[in-house]
């Protein structure tokens, strides 16, 4: 018995070969002897039943001259898994067709962190093995159900599942979209008074995107977090529902999600969490955003540089006179110099020598007041 493997929804070709390599009379039947189709000597394909009943069955007329009389079954269904009989030259050839199906749990669009379950449906009596390869090259194998917990952004793309049965294989390709922001976290460094822009690009594109979102903000100086803005998303158009009066936020009406603050102030420094709930999805997308604000000031004989917001302990804060060595450099959030000499002073926030934020302040001779450029 010849074995042919097929994929639901696609086509399968069941072979039937003549020893004489020329056109001859043949008939394809179901195992219960019902006729499917055949050729009875006039080179015309005769179907066994009503057109609607047999419209998925066909043969390759072009192959008949070469003594090949395949049965083509289109739009395969799971119930097509059975034995088919080809009758030609006073002999019967049995061909077993097994149709398989691999599906993703409920949806192919999954939120980051959710689980993906791939299920293999196979005909009774079959004992296939299945192995799936993720877009990032990770292999998972198992029985009829394969699970991947904690989906990551790199899991977005085409998953390839190979079903193996009796040394024959059939390959399935499933497109999985992991719904997430491009970055889990971002940090913005600004001098006091500068404009601030926050961007929240999504890592996926869909034709219609609908949902709602909110940005909660925990200012470093505040005891509790506060909702800064709530918005709706309808077919990729953003509409603001409610916005705090301080700060005066503006939000762009089209993707990627984008917010602007007119100016960076110490009282705004802190961490935000933007959540986006998508229609017909359980769970939410999250992106953390951090704002670090720097201020350089001179009061009487004290030149001070301060930063507010979530800074890493390894960041260095320095005060230096332009083109000179740093006068003071500490892993702290405030540094100062007493009786600074006149000139242009620089306050620098740096990470392993890379300057993240810089603020200049001009110190005038002691009889005048400082100038902040």
């Amino acid at each position: 018995k010849t074995l042919v493997l097929g994929k639901e929804g696609e086509s399968a070709e069941l072979p039937c070969e003549s020893s004489q390599k020329k056109i001859t009379v043949f008939t394809w039947k179901f195992s219960d002897q019902r006729k499917i189709l055949g050729q009875h000597g006039k080179g015309v394909l005769i179907r066994g039943g009503s057109p609607s009943q047999f419209d998925r069955f066909d043969s390759k007329k072009g192959a008949w001259e070469k003594g090949s009389f395949p049965l083509i079954i289109n739009k395969l269904k799971m119930e097509d898994s059975q034995t088919y009989i080809c009758e030609l030259e006073n002999r019967k050839e049995e061909v077993e067709l097994w149709v398989f199906k691999v599906t993703a749990n409920s949806d192919t669009h999954l939120l980051q962190g959710q689980s993906l379950t791939l299920t293999l449906e196979s005909p009774p009596g079959s004992s296939p093995s299945v192995q799936c390869r993720s877009p990032r090259g990770k292999n998972i194998q198992g029985g009829k159900t394969l699970s991947v917990s904690q989906l990551e952004l790199q899991d977005s793309g085409t998953w390839t599942c190979t079903v193996l049965q009796n040394q024959k294989k059939v390959e399935f390709k499933i497109d999985i979209v992991v719904l997430a922001f491009q970055k889990a976290s971002s940090i913005v460094y600004k001098k006091e008074g500068e404009q601030v822009e926050f961007s929240f690009p999504l890592a996926f594109t869909v034709e219609k995107l609908t949902g709602s979102g909110e940005l909660w903000w925990q200012a470093e100086r505040a005891s509790s977090s506060k909702s800064w803005i709530t918005f709706d998303l309808k077919n990729k158009e953003v509409s603001v529902k409610r916005v705090t009066q301080d700060p005066k936020l503006q939000m762009g009406k089209k993707l990627p999600l984008h917010l602007t603050l007119p100016q960076a102030l110490p009282q705004y420094a802190g961490s935000g969490n933007l959540t986006l709930a998508l229609e017909a999805k359980t769970g939410k997308l999250h992106q953390e955003v951090n704002l670090v604000v720097m201020r350089a000031t001179q009061l009487q004989k004290n030149l001070t540089c301060e930063v507010w917001g979530p800074t890493s302990p390894k960041l260095m804060l320095s005060l230096k006179l332009e083109n000179k060595e740093a006068k003071v450099s500490k892993r702290e959030k405030a540094v100062w110099v007493l009786n600074p000499e006149a000139g242009m002073w620089q306050c620098l926030l740096s990470d392993s020598g890379q300057v993240l934020l810089e603020s200049n302040i001009k110190v005038l001779p002691t009889w005048s007041t400082p100038v902040q450029p």
Epitope: E197, E237, S239, Q250, G252, K253, K254, T260
Partner: antibody, heavy 119, light 107 residues
């Protein structure tokens, strides 16, 4: 070719009402956001009101909020601007404009209809 | 609402001149800005969208650029048909706002 044609302008007394229409041809109306923009005699352009393609979200300039209402009828491919409590400063040429698919600019404009508010 | 400050309000130039018009936004607006040309008695026409994209059918002498919240429209070599009024429009968020306009006149 996409065309927009405004109508409904005219002379009205202060405190009166008027309804402007903008008939669109050559496009699937519900796909695009639409806006009304006006221009007072000898002055610059002023955005007045906007509506999302779905018709669910409407937006207004502060100068007309509470007095003007923007609506659309997708079956008639028509945009409307209901103007109530009209003032002399509402005197202008009113244009309707269609936005691009991604709300990125006003790519098609009508020729405008004139509204005069005077006693 | 976001304010758009356009300058200059009027400008005299000759055919062949290079001209620049600027708009400054009171808030960050990404690239969500368009430049429109209007001739007397006519509806405005889009020249540039998304700060620097040239609208189909618009001559390449028109170009747009952005630096932070400052936006510039440049006409590299003025042609007689370019004498008109130019407006910037922020479509970052509602309510949309136009600049005050720049009237470009023949010197």
């Amino acid at each position: 070719e996409v065309e927009l044609l405004e109508s409904g302008g005219g002379l009205v007394q202060p405190g009166g009402s008027l309804r402007l229409s903008c008939a669109a041809s050559g496009l699937t109306f519900s796909t695009f956001a639409m806006s009304w923009v006006r221009q007072a005699p000898g002055k610059g352009l002023e955005w007045v009101s906007g509506i999302s393609g779905s018709g669910e979200n409407t937006y207004y300039a502060d100068s007309v909020k509470g007095r003007f209402t923007i609506t659309s009828d997708n079956s008639k491919n028509t945009l409307y601007l209901q103007m109530n409590s009209l003032r002399a400063e509402d005197t202008a040429v009113y244009y309707c404009a269609k936005e691009g698919y991604n709300w990125n600019y006003m790519d098609v404009w009508g020729k405008g209809t004139t509204v005069t508010v005077s006693s | 609402a976001i304010q758009m400050t356009q300058s200059p309000s009027s400008l005299s130039a000759s055919v062949g001149d290079r001209v620049t018009i600027t708009c400054r936004a009171s808030h960050g607006i990404r690239n969500d800005l368009g430049w429109y040309q209007q001739k007397p008695g006519k509806a405005p026409k889009v020249l540039i969208y998304e700060a620097s994209s040239l609208q189909s059918g618009v001559p390449s002498r028109f170009s747009g650029s952005r630096s932070g919240t400052d936006f510039t429209l440049t006409i590299s070599s003025l042609q007689p048909e370019d004498f008109a009024t130019y407006y910037c429009l922020q479509d970052y968020t509602y309510p949309y706002t136009f600049g005050q306009g720049t009237k470009l006149e023949i010197k």
